[in-house]
Interface confidence: low
C-alpha cells in the first residue's frame, strides 16, 4: 500500500496552524479545520484548511495566489459599488468598515428604486435593498447592478440581456445572466457577490425563505373546489391528481454528525408544521443520503398529506441509519426524488402539469462521489417540461431550495442546484446548525395572518364570478329618478371599495344594493363611508361643474361576507397580503410595494366591465412614464371642462389616466363601471391600484360600445397609493396587515 | 437509439409543393421542440423553422415565411414541413433536428433528404 | 450573408492547436449561449459544443469553446485528420427571435 493511503486520518500537525486574533476548531476528525474570528473580522486568507495526503495542511493562498505564512483575522469591509448607472453615490472609498454608510442619488430625469441609503454590516453586506436609477425607458426596468458585481448590457428591451461578474476570488450567487421577459419582469434571481466568509444570518434566511415559499404556496392551483375560509386562513383543497409535493432531502454523510442530523431533523419538523399553518396539505417524500438514499416516505404513500403522520416518520429516523456508508452522493438523493416525481409506463397521470414540486435540501458541503447532482435537477425539469418551450416555460412548478451548513460549503455547488426566480432566493449558507434551527424557528415564529388575497381559481367550467371573484355589483335605486349602477371590488368580509360619486347623500341604505359572487341575492348595507375630502360641487364656483377629487367609498355590510370560490378579497396596496402576493421580503415598505406596482412607466393594467350579462377583463395601460401628461391634458376634452385653464385644477396627483392609442388602443369605461377596480396583475394575484372614476368620452351611449373612439377618450381612476391613510383606518379592524 | 429519419424529398418544378416528415425513435418525441435545417449544395447551414413540443408554437426563417408550414403528430411521432410555392433558391438538403432542452441548439440530427427545384 | 462571421477556412498541421472564430453582435452573441457544430464531409451535423463551453458525451475534450463579449471561439487542441470538417456557430438571436448560424468554417489539417 502507498505511504499516503495507510496514513491515518487526521494525521496533519497542528503546529504553526494558529490564526493571529482568532481561533480554530477541526472538522471531520482532523481532516479539516476551519478558523474563527471575533464578529466583524474575517479569517485571511482563507477560511477552512484540508489535511492533505502528505500529512501537511493545505497551503495559505490568497485569492490571487500568493502564499501566505501565518492566517490572520482581519477587519470585514463591503465591497464598493464597481459601477452606479445614471446617479452619483457617495462617500466613494476603495472600501467600507462595518458600519459606513454610503447614499445614492440619480441624476435628473431618473427615479430611485431601493433604497438611498445603506449601511454595511458585521456579515460584510450592504443593508437594504439594490440602488437603481431608472428612466422607465425599457420594457424591463433597469435591473440594476448589486454592489460588488458587474453588469454587461444596458439595453432593456423584451429579451434583452443582461449578465453580472464577480471579482475573482468572490462566488456570484444567482443568476449569471437575466433576460427582459414579456410582461416586463427579469428571468432569474438578482446576483451578489459572495466571500467564503459570508454567511446568511438566521433573520435574513427566514424572510427570503418565508417569502418565496409563501408564494409557491399561495399560487397553487385547486381545480375542484375550495371550501369556506376558516378564520384567517383559506384551505386550499387539492385536486386528487395532487396539487403540491415537497420533496425533504436531508443529508446523512458522516461529516455532518448526529447532533447536527437532529438539529435538521427539527428544522424540517418546524417547516411541516409552517406549511400546515397555511391551511395547505400537500403531499411530502422523506430523503436521508450518503453514500445511498433512503426513502422514508414517498409521495404516493396515502398518508404523505398528513402532516402529523410525516412528523412521526420523521423524528424516527436515526442517524445510524447511514452509518457504514459515509460518502456523499448528492446525485443518488435526488435521483431518489426523481423516481418519486415519475410515473410508471411513463404514462403522466390526470392533472400531473398542476402539481407543483418543491425540493428543500440541507448539506453540509460537497458531494464527493456519484457525479454531478445537477445533471438530475436537469431530468426533472425535462420530466415536468420546465423550461422547454420559451412562451410557456412552467417556471413556477418546480422550487429548489439548498440549505448549505457550515463552512465546507461549496457556493458554486449549492448556486447551480438552487432555483433561481425574481425576487426570491432559494440557496442559503449558514454558520451551523443553530443559526438552520434558528432559521425556522423564526419562521415558525412568524404568525401573520394569511388571507389570501387576489387569487383567481381557474377552472375549465369557471363562471365570471371565479375569475373575477373579487366583482361586485351595485345599484341604487331612487324612486321616480330611476337608478344608478356601479362596481366595486371586495377588499375585506365586511368592506367593498367602490367610487363616491356612485351615491349621494340623500341615498338610504335600504335603496343600495350589492351583489358578489354572481349571486341573485343582495346583501344588506350597514353604511356607506365617503372619504372627507370628496365634494362633487367642491369647485363649482370656479367654473368647474363636476369635482372628483378622492372619488372613493366604502360600503360596510351587515354580515360578513363567506369566501368562497367565487367570492374573495382583492389585494390592496401597502398591505401584508400584497407583500406576499408580490413574492417581496416581509420588511418590503409601502414604498417598495409602490414602485413594483406603479414604476414611471407605462404599466399594463385591468378593469373588469359588464357587456351583455358577461363580466370580461379589458387591458389598458396606465400612463405613468412620458406620456403621463399628455394623458391628463386630455380631460381639456371633458364636457364642461373645456373653460379649465390650467388642467391640475381638474386632474389632481390623486388620479391615474388610462385610455388613447399608445402603446396601444386601450379600451375605455363606460358609465356603470364606475367604482370598479383597476387592477395590476403581477405574478398570478391580483392588486387593486385604482378606483374607476370619471372618463372624458362616453363611449358607451346607446348601452352599446363603440368601436371607434377618438385618441383623446381617457379615463381617470383614483390612485389607492393616495388614500391610504383613509383606507387603513376605515379597514384597521379587518386584519389586512397595513404597513 | 435515437434517431430521425426525413422522407419525402425529390425532384419538383417551381411553384410546386412537397411535403417532408421525419420519424422519431429512441426518445419521447412529445417532450423536444424540433427544427428544420436546410443546406444548399456547397453552402452553409440555413435554419428554417422550429416548432414547440406540444406543436402549439410555431417559429419561421424569414425567407420561407408564409410558403412553408411545420407541423407533428406526437401520436406517430413525426414532424412535418409542407413547403408550397416552391423556388429555385429553396433547393437543399433538409435536415430534421431535434432541439436541446437547456438551450437553442439541435442535439440530434436526421441523415438528411434532398429537395430539387428544377424547371 | 450570414449576420455571423466565421472565417472561410482554417487550417493546421496534426498536434497542432487551432482556433475558429465567430463574429456577432449584442442581439445574438453578446446576449445569448453558443452553440458549436461540426460536419464531416457527406455527413450530417454534430452538436459540439452547447452553452458556450458545455462538450456533450462523447466529444473528446480536445475541442473547447469559450465566449466574451459578442464573439465566441472554438479551440481544438492535437489536431487530428478526422478533424478536417467544417464547423458552425450558433447563437440564438433576439432581434431575429431565430437561431441564426455562421457562414462555416472549412478546417484542413495539412
Known amino acids: 500500500t502507498p505511504w499516503s493511503l495507510a496514513r491515518p486520518q487526521g494525521s496533519c500537525s497542528l503546529e504553526g496552524v494558529e490564526i493571529k486574533g482568532g481561533s480554530f476548531r477541526l472538522l471531520q476528525e482532523g481532516q479539516a479545520l476551519e478558523y474563527v474570528c471575533p464578529s466583524g473580522f474575517y479569517p485571511y486568507p482563507v477560511q477552512t484548511r484540508t489535511c492533505r495526503s502528505t500529512g501537511s495542511w493545505s497551503t495559505l493562498k490568497t485569492q490571487d495566489q500568493k502564499t501566505v505564512r501565518k492566517a490572520e483575522c482581519r477587519a470585514i469591509h463591503c465591497p464598493r459599488p464597481h459601477d452606479f448607472e445614471n446617479g452619483e453615490y457617495w462617500p466613494r472609498s476603495p472600501y467600507y468598515n462595518v458600519s459606513d454608510e454610503i447614499s445614492f442619488h440619480c441624476y435628473d430625469g431618473y427615479t430611485l428604486r431601493g433604497s438611498a441609503n445603506r449601511t454595511c454590516q458585521v456579515n460584510g453586506r450592504w443593508s437594504g435593498q439594490t440602488a437603481i436609477c431608472d428612466n422607465g425607458a425599457g420594457y424591463c426596468s433597469n435591473p440594476g447592478i448589486p454592489i460588488g458585481t458587474r453588469k454587461v448590457g444596458s439595453q432593456y428591451r423584451l429579451e434583452d440581456s443582461v449578465t453580472y461578474h464577480c471579482s475573482r476570488g468572490l462566488t456570484l450567487r444567482g443568476s449569471q445572466r437575466r433576460t427582459c421577459q414579456e410582461g416586463g419582469s427579469w428571468s432569474g434571481t438578482e446576483p451578489s457577490c459572495q466571500d467564503s466568509f459570508m454567511y446568511d444570518t438566521p433573520q435574513e434566511v427566514a424572510e427570503a425563505f418565508l417569502s418565496s415559499l409563501t408564494e409557491t404556496i399561495e399560487g397553487v392551483d385547486a381545480e375542484d373546489g375550495h371550501g369556506p375560509g376558516e378564520q384567517q386562513k383559506r384551505k386550499i383543497v387539492l385536486d386528487p391528481s395532487g396539487s403540491m409535493n415537497i420533496y425533504l432531502v436531508l443529508d446523512g454523510s458522516d461529516s455532518i454528525g448526529a447532533s447536527n442530523f437532529t438539529g435538521a431533523k427539527k428544522c424540517l419538523v418546524n417547516l411541516i408544521e409552517k406549511v400546515a399553518s397555511y391551511g395547505v396539505k400537500p403531499r411530502y417524500g422523506l430523503v436521508t443520503y450518503a453514500t445511498y438514499p433512503k426513502i422514508w416516505v414517498k409521495v404516493s404513500e396515502a398518508d404523505s398529506s398528513n402532516a402529523d403522520w410525516v412528523t412521526k416518520q420523521l423524528n424516527e429516523i436515526n442517524y445510524e441509519d447511514h452509518k457504514l456508508k459515509s460518502g456523499t452522493n448528492t446525485k443518488k438523493a435526488l435521483q431518489a426524488v426523481y423516481s418519486m416525481m415519475s410515473w410508471p409506463d411513463d404514462v403522466p397521470p390526470e392533472g400531473w402539469n398542476r402539481t407543483r414540486h418543491v425540493i428543500i435540501l440541507m448539506t453540509d458541503g460537497l458531494h464527493n462521489m456519484g457525479g454531478d447532482p445537477i445533471t438530475v435537477i436537469d431530468e426533472i425539469r425535462d420530466l415536468l417540461y420546465i423550461g422547454k418551450d420559451r412562451k410557456n416555460p412552467r417556471e413556477d412548478y418546480l422550487d429548489v431550495y439548498v440549505f448549505g451548513v457550515g463552512p465546507l460549503v461549496n457556493q458554486v455547488n449549492i448556486n447551480a442546484l438552487a432555483s433561481k426566480k425574481d425576487n426570491e432566493q432559494h440557496v442559503f449558507k449558514v454558520k451551523d446548525m443553530e443559526n438552520l434551527e434558528d432559521v425556522f424557528y423564526q419562521m415558525i415564529d412568524e404568525s401573520q395572518s394569511l388571507s389570501l388575497c387576489g387569487m383567481v381559481w381557474e377552472h375549465r367550467k369557471g363562471t365570471d364570478y371565479h375569475k373575477q371573484p373579487w366583482q361586485a355589483k351595485i345599484s341604487v335605486i331612487r324612486p321616480s329618478k330611476g337608478h344608478e349602477s356601479c362596481m366595486g371590488a371586495v377588499v375585506s368580509e365586511y368592506f367593498v371599495l367602490t367610487a363616491a360619486h356612485c351615491f349621494t347623500v340623500d341615498d338610504k341604505e335600504h335603496s343600495i344594493k350589492v351583489s358578489v359572487g354572481g349571486e341573485k341575492r343582495d346583501l344588506e348595507i350597514e353604511v356607506v363611508l365617503f372619504h372627507p375630502n370628496y365634494n362633487i360641487n367642491g369647485k363649482k364656483e370656479a367654473g368647474i361643474p363636476e369635482f372628483y377629487d378622492y372619488d372613493v367609498a366604502l360600503i360596510k355590510l351587515k354580515n360578513k361576507l363567506k369566501y368562497g370560490q367565487t367570492i374573495r378579497p382583492i389585494c390592496l396596496p401597502c398591505t401584508e397580503g400584497t407583500t406576499r402576493a408580490l413574492r417581496l421580503p416581509p420588511t418590503t415598505t409601502c414604498q417598495q410595494q409602490k414602485e413594483e406596482l406603479l414604476p414611471a412607466q407605462d404599466i399594463k393594467a385591468l378593469f373588469v366591465s359588464e357587456e351583455e350579462k358577461k363580466l370580461t377583463r379589458k387591458e389598458v395601460y396606465i400612463k405613468n412614464g412620458d406620456k403621463k401628461g399628455s394623458c391628463e391634458r386630455d380631460a381639456q376634452y371633458a364636457p364642461g371642462y373645456d373653460k379649465v385653464k390650467d388642467i391640475s385644477e381638474v386632474v389632481t396627483p390623486r388620479f391615474l389616466c388610462t385610455g388613447g392609442v399608445s402603446p396601444y388602443a386601450d379600451p375605455n369605461t363606460c358609465r356603470g363601471d364606475s367604482g370598479g377596480p383597476l387592477i395590476v396583475h403581477k405574478r398570478s394575484r391580483f392588486i387593486q391600484v385604482g378606483v374607476i372614476s370619471w372618463g372624458v368620452v362616453d363611449v358607451c351611449k346607446n348601452q352599446k360600445r363603440q368601436k371607434q373612439v377618438p385618441a383623446h377618450a381617457r379615463d381617470f381612476h383614483i390612485n389607492l397609493f393616495q388614500v391610504l391613510p383613509w383606507l387603513k383606518e376605515k379597514l384597521q379592524d379587518e386584519d389586512l396587515g397595513f404597513l | 437509439e435515437v434517431q430521425l429519419l426525413e422522407s419525402g424529398g425529390g425532384l419538383v418544378q417551381p411553384g410546386g409543393s412537397l411535403r417532408l416528415s421525419c420519424a422519431a425513435s429512441?426518445?419521447?418525441?412529445?417532450?423536444?421542440?424540433m427544427n428544420w435545417v436546410r443546406q444548399a449544395p456547397g453552402k452553409g447551414l440555413e435554419w428554417v423553422a422550429t416548432v414547440s413540443y406540444d406543436g402549439n408554437y410555431k417559429y419561421y426563417a424569414d425567407s420561407v415565411k408564409g410558403r412553408f408550414t411545420i407541423s407533428r403528430d406526437n401520436s406517430k411521432n413525426t414532424l412535418y414541413l409542407q413547403m408550397n410555392s416552391l423556388r429555385a433558391e429553396d433547393t437543399a438538403v433538409y435536415y430534421c433536428?431535434?432541439?436541446?432542452?437547456?438551450?437553442?441548439?439541435?442535439?440530434?440530427w436526421g441523415q438528411g433528404t434532398l429537395v430539387t427545384v428544377s424547371s | 450573408q450570414s449576420v455571423l462571421t466565421q472565417p472561410p477556412s482554417a487550417s493546421g498541421t496534426p498536434g497542432q492547436r487551432v482556433t475558429i472564430s465567430c463574429t456577432g453582435s449584442s442581439s445574438n452573441i453578446g446576449n445569448n449561449a453558443v452553440n458549436w457544430y461540426q460536419q464531416l464531409p457527406g455527413t450530417a451535423p454534430k452538436l459540439l459544443i452547447y452553452n458556450n463551453n458545455q462538450r456533450p458525451s462523447g466529444v473528446p475534450d480536445r475541442f473547447s469553446g469559450s465566449k466574451s463579449g459578442t464573439s465566441a471561439s472554438l479551440a481544438i487542441s492535437g489536431l487530428r485528420s478526422e478533424d478536417e470538417a467544417d464547423y458552425y456557430c450558433?447563437?440564438?438571436?433576439?432581434?431575429?427571435?431565430?437561431?441564426?448560424f455562421g457562414g462555416g468554417t472549412k478546417l484542413t489539417v495539412l
Open positions: 433536428a431535434r432541439e436541446g432542452y437547456y438551450y437553442y441548439g439541435m442535439d440530434v
Open positions: 429512441g426518445f419521447t418525441f412529445s417532450k423536444h421542440s
Open positions: 450558433q447563437p440564438y438571436d433576439d432581434s431575429l427571435s431565430s437561431v441564426v
